[in-house]
């Protein structure tokens, strides 16, 4: 080995050296909080990278760039450290118009932390590995979301858009005129019925066990889906979206409410077959799954 | 295709009377706001004549009040206009709107549905 390459392997093995890099990091990352920072963190800024470039060489000189088996750029934490001194330098010295985006990776810098805490290292070695494990979860887990999203295609197409409609008009308006001329939030409010403290027209439905209008209204098929048009089952995208809104349990209750509603009571059972299985089967085998993955890394 | 049947128009002298009749039979029709009579005179725009909402409150042009009733059998689907003392100028083609949801078997769809007119004709 030449001199060079003993000094730098001295440096690399030794505990201060991980200690400056750690305590580099965690300033580093003080300094990024900073809403203002005044003119002289622009020095500290290039300390920094001058640290990390020292770190990178230092790390490349004792263990070779890229051709052996255990050298810089075969291990692939370091290939974020490569990164974080590549867009260091690129933000610097390259004019590249719109900075500020290049500047986003800057916060590249504070993953440099795992690294360097061998703890923090395991965890997220686990973490790649249990994310490795899950792509057969993943696979069945789409997959069920998928054909559930066709079937609450098929039953609900089109169901949240039912709307309670005032039974009175004037002379020259008829249900098409009004569709057509319907925008503000203020022309729905004329015309339908909601339920105080409601942005949404209240729903109904077809059905003798859907929900019925109140007196002087009348169901029928106008307007946007509720929720801005967020919420409803009319294309297979929208419908896999509140499948997964289903499965995650993110305010499922008022999905559910408002498909029975617009729908019929009947549908309950399509949501309890969702839940169960969406909710408390498939979301707990990625759990298990994950949970695998931790003790595997462990052991 | 949707249809609405009308039927009861003709020929009849001034004061006069005559009984129009609008029947959404086809099980397509699920539910109207309301069900209509308009009509069109020669040269002139289509206006409304007389309307019955589902929950039976009814709405009448100026010209057709006192004059002219409008009823429904909910049973039958049907929708009647009786017209009693008709007078030259109520000579047009009158139609039948019904303004609500049909079914189309996959979907339910909202809007106006037209009926192919019926003739009344008040000449001497």
């Known amino acids: 080995f030449s001199p060079l390459r003993r000094i730098s392997i001295k440096i690399l093995v030794h505990s201060l050296f991980s200690m400056l890099i750690m305590c580099t990091i965690l300033t580093n990352c003080i300094f990024m909080t900073m809403n203002n920072p005044p003119d002289w963190t622009k020095n500290v800024e290039y300390t920094f990278t001058g640290i990390y470039t020292f770190e990178s060489l230092v790390k490349i000189l004792a263990r070779g760039f890229c051709v052996g088996e255990f050298t810089f750029l075969r291990d692939p934490w370091n290939w974020l450290d490569f990164v974080v001194i590549v867009f260091a330098y690129l933000t610097e010295f390259v004019n590249l118009g719109n900075v500020s985006a290049l500047r986003t990776f800057r916060v590249l810098r504070a993953l440099k932390t795992i690294s360097v805490i061998p703890g923090l290292k395991t965890i997220v070695g686990a973490l790649i590995q249990s994310v490795k494990k899950l792509s057969d979860v993943m696979i069945l887990t789409v997959f069920c979301l998928s054909v559930f999203a066709l079937i609450g295609l098929q039953l609900f197409m089109g169901n949240l858009k039912h709307k309670c409609f005032r039974n009175s008009l004037e002379n020259n308006e008829t249900l098409e005129s009004i569709m057509n001329t319907l925008e503000s939030e203020e022309d729905f409010r004329k015309y339908f019925y909601y339920l105080e403290g409601s942005k949404d027209a209240l729903l109904c439905g077809f059905s003798t066990d859907s929900g019925q209008c109140p007196e002087g209204y009348t169901c029928v098929k106008i307007g946007r889906n509720p929720d801005y048009g967020y919420t409803s089952f009319d294309t297979f995208s929208w419908a896999f979206l509140a499948l997964f809104r289903l499965m995650t349990q993110d305010y499922w209750e008022n999905l559910y409410q408002q498909t029975l509603r617009a729908a019929g009571k009947t549908y309950m059972i399509f949501f309890v077959v969702v839940i169960f299985l969406g909710s408390f089967y498939l979301i707990n085998l990625i759990l298990a799954v994950v949970a695998m993955a931790y003790e595997e890394q462990n052991q | 295709e949707v249809q609405l049947v009308e039927s009861g128009g003709g020929v009849v002298q001034p004061g006069g009377s005559l009984r129009l009749s609008c029947a959404a039979s086809s099980r397509q029709f699920i539910r109207d706001v309301f069900t209509g009579w308009y009509r069109r005179a020669p040269g002139k725009q289509r206006e409304l004549v007389a309307r019955?909402?589902?929950?039976?409150?009814?709405q009448y042009a100026d010209s057709a009040k006192g004059r002219f009733t409008i009823s429904r059998d909910n049973a039958k689907k049907t929708v009647y206009l009786q017209m009693n003392s008709l007078r030259p100028e109520d000579t047009a083609l009158y139609y039948c709107?019904?303004?609500?949801?049909?079914?189309?078997?996959?979907?339910?769809?909202?809007?106006?549905?037209w009926g192919q007119g019926t003739l009344v004709t008040v000449s001497s």
């Open positions: 709107l019904f303004s609500g949801t049909i079914s189309t078997g996959r979907e339910y769809r909202s809007g106006d549905y």
């Open positions: 019955i909402y589902n929950e039976g409150n009814t």
